[in-house]
C-alpha cells in the first residue's frame, strides 16, 4: 500500500492525424520526491517528450497543475499529432538527486497509433 505505482491506464490510444492525443498517467504516492518525465520508446535510444522539471515542449500541455504540491496526475496532451508520433509512450518517475535525478519507476506504457485524418465532406456539384 505504501509503494509508489505508476499507472498508465490505457494500453493503447488511437488518434486521427491533426488531433491532440491525451496520454494518462497517475502516481499512487507523493514520495519519493522528484520529477516525472515522459518518453517515447524504451532503453538508451528513447526520446524525451516532456520533463516536468525543465525544458521547452511546445506541443505538450499538462492536464492538471503539476506544480501543485499534492498533485498525483501527470497526464499530458500532445497537439497536432502526425504519423511520426506513433509509438509507445512511458511515464517515468525519478527520485531527486544531483547532478542527475535517478530513475525510479516506469509505467507500463501506452501505445499511440495514428489514423489518417478524416476527409472533409465535399460539397455536391
Amino acid at each position: 500500500e505504501d509503494e509508489l505505482q505508476v499507472i498508465q491506464p490505457e494500453k493503447s490510444v488511437s488518434v486521427a492525424a491533426g488531433e491532440s492525443a491525451t496520454l494518462r498517467c497517475a502516481m499512487t504516492s507523493l514520495i519519493p520526491v522528484g520529477p516525472i518525465m515522459w518518453f517515447r520508446g524504451a532503453g538508451a535510444g528513447r526520446e524525451l517528450i516532456y520533463n516536468q522539471k525543465e525544458g521547452h515542449f511546445p506541443r505538450v500541455t499538462t492536464v492538471s497543475e503539476l506544480t501543485k504540491r499534492n498533485n498525483l496526475d501527470f497526464s499530458i496532451s500532445i497537439s497536432n499529432i502526425t504519423p511520426a508520433d506513433a509509438g509507445t509512450y512511458y511515464c517515468v518517475k525519478f527520485r531527486k538527486g544531483s547532478p542527475d535525478d535517478v530513475e525510479f519507476k516506469s509505467g507500463a506504457g501506452t501505445e499511440l497509433s495514428v489514423r489518417e485524418a478524416a476527409l472533409a465532406p465535399t460539397a455536391p456539384l
Epitope: 505504501d2 509508489l4 507523493l30 514520495i31 519519493p32 520526491v33 538527486g97 535517478v102 525510479f104
Partner: antibody
Framework: QVQLQQPGAERVKPGASVKMSCKAS????????ITWVKQRPGQGLEWIGD????????NHIEKFKSKATLTVDTSSNTAYMQLSRLTSEDSAVYYC?????????????WGQGTTLTVSS | DIQMTQSPASLSASVGETVTITCRAS??????LAWYQQKQGKSPQLLVY???TLAEGVPSRFSGSGSGTQFSLKINSLQPEDFGNYYC?????????FGSGTRLVIK
C-alpha cells in the same frame, strides 16, 4: 542478510580531512540509496545526505554541502564520506544506513557507526 | 527544509504503562513520517514508516498514527526493552530531518 560494516573509530587532528567507509553486503549495492547520519555525544540524529551507488547522484542538507563529500566504489560495494576542515564540532558518531525504504526516505538497515574524534 | 518538533523531550514511565510521544512537522508531510528507537551505544532501529506501518519484527504494542503535521507513536504495556531514545523523521524529501528525540526512562 543485509549488513553495513563501519570502522569503530577514527582519530584525526583539527583542520585535517577524514574519509570514512561503509561496506555493504547481502543485497544489490547499486539498487538502494545509502544515507549518512551524524550524532554528537548525548545529542540527536542529524541527516547529512545520501548517495545512489548506481549513478553516484547525491543529496545533501545545506549545512553539510561544503563539509561532506559522498562517493561510492561499486567494485568493493563500499560507500565513503569524506569530511573536510575538521573541527571539534565534527566529533560525533557517523552512521550509514540503507534498505528497501531508502528510496522512500526511511532506513531499514544501519551500520554500527564510526566514532570520529577530532583532537590535537 | 522541513523542521520536526518532538515532545516530550523526556518521559519516565513504569513497565506495563502506556505512553505516547508526539511529533509535529513545520509543514504538511501527509503521512510520510518514520519512527526509530535507539538504545544507549547502539544504532537506531526502524519502528514505523509512512506514519502507521510497523517495520518487520516490531511488536504490535507499538503503533503510529497521524497525518499532515501532527503525528504520534504509542507504546502499549511498556516492556523493559522499550526504554531508550525515540526519534521521528519525515520522509517527504530529500532532504530528510529528524526530531530532537524523546528519552524514555524507567520510573
Amino acid at each position: 542478510q543485509v549488513q553495513l560494516q563501519q570502522p569503530g573509530a577514527e582519530r584525526v587532528k583539527p583542520g585535517a580531512s577524514v574519509k570514512m567507509s561503509c561496506k555493504a553486503s547481502g543485497y544489490t549495492f547499486t539498487s538502494y540509496w545509502i544515507t549518512w547520519v551524524k550524532q554528537r555525544p548525548g545529542q540527536g540524529l542529524e541527516w547529512i545526505g545520501d548517495i545512489y551507488p548506481g549513478s553516484g547522484s547525491t543529496n545533501h542538507i545545506e549545512k553539510f554541502k561544503s563539509k561532506a563529500t559522498l562517493t561510492v566504489d561499486t567494485s568493493s560495494n563500499t560507500a565513503y564520506m569524506q569530511l573536510s576542515r575538521l573541527t571539534s564540532e565534527d566529533s560525533a558518531v557517523y552512521y550509514c544506513a540503507t534498505g528497501y525504504g531508502s528510496s522512500y526516505g526511511y532506513f531499514d538497515y544501519w551500520g554500527q557507526g564510526t566514532t570520529l574524534t577530532v583532537s590535537s | 527544509d522541513i523542521q520536526m518538533t518532538q515532545s516530550p523531550a523526556s518521559l519516565s514511565a513504569s513497565v506495563g504503562e502506556t505512553v505516547t510521544i508526539t511529533c509535529r512537522a513545520s509543514e504538511n508531510i501527509y503521512s510520510y513520517l518514520a519512527w526509530y528507537q535507539q538504545k544507549q551505544g547502539k544504532s537506531p532501529q526502524l519502528l514505523v514508516y509512512t506514519a502507521k506501518t510497523l517495520a518487520e519484527g516490531v511488536p504490535s504494542r507499538f503503533s503510529g498514527s497521524g497525518s499532515g503535521t501532527q503525528f504520534s507513536l504509542k507504546i502499549n504495556s511498556l516492556q523493559p526493552e522499550d526504554f531508550g531514545n525515540y526519534y521521528c523523521q519525515h520522509q517527504y524529501g530529500p532532504p530528510f530531518t529528524f526530531g530532537s528525540g524523546t528519552r524514555l526512562v524507567i520510573k
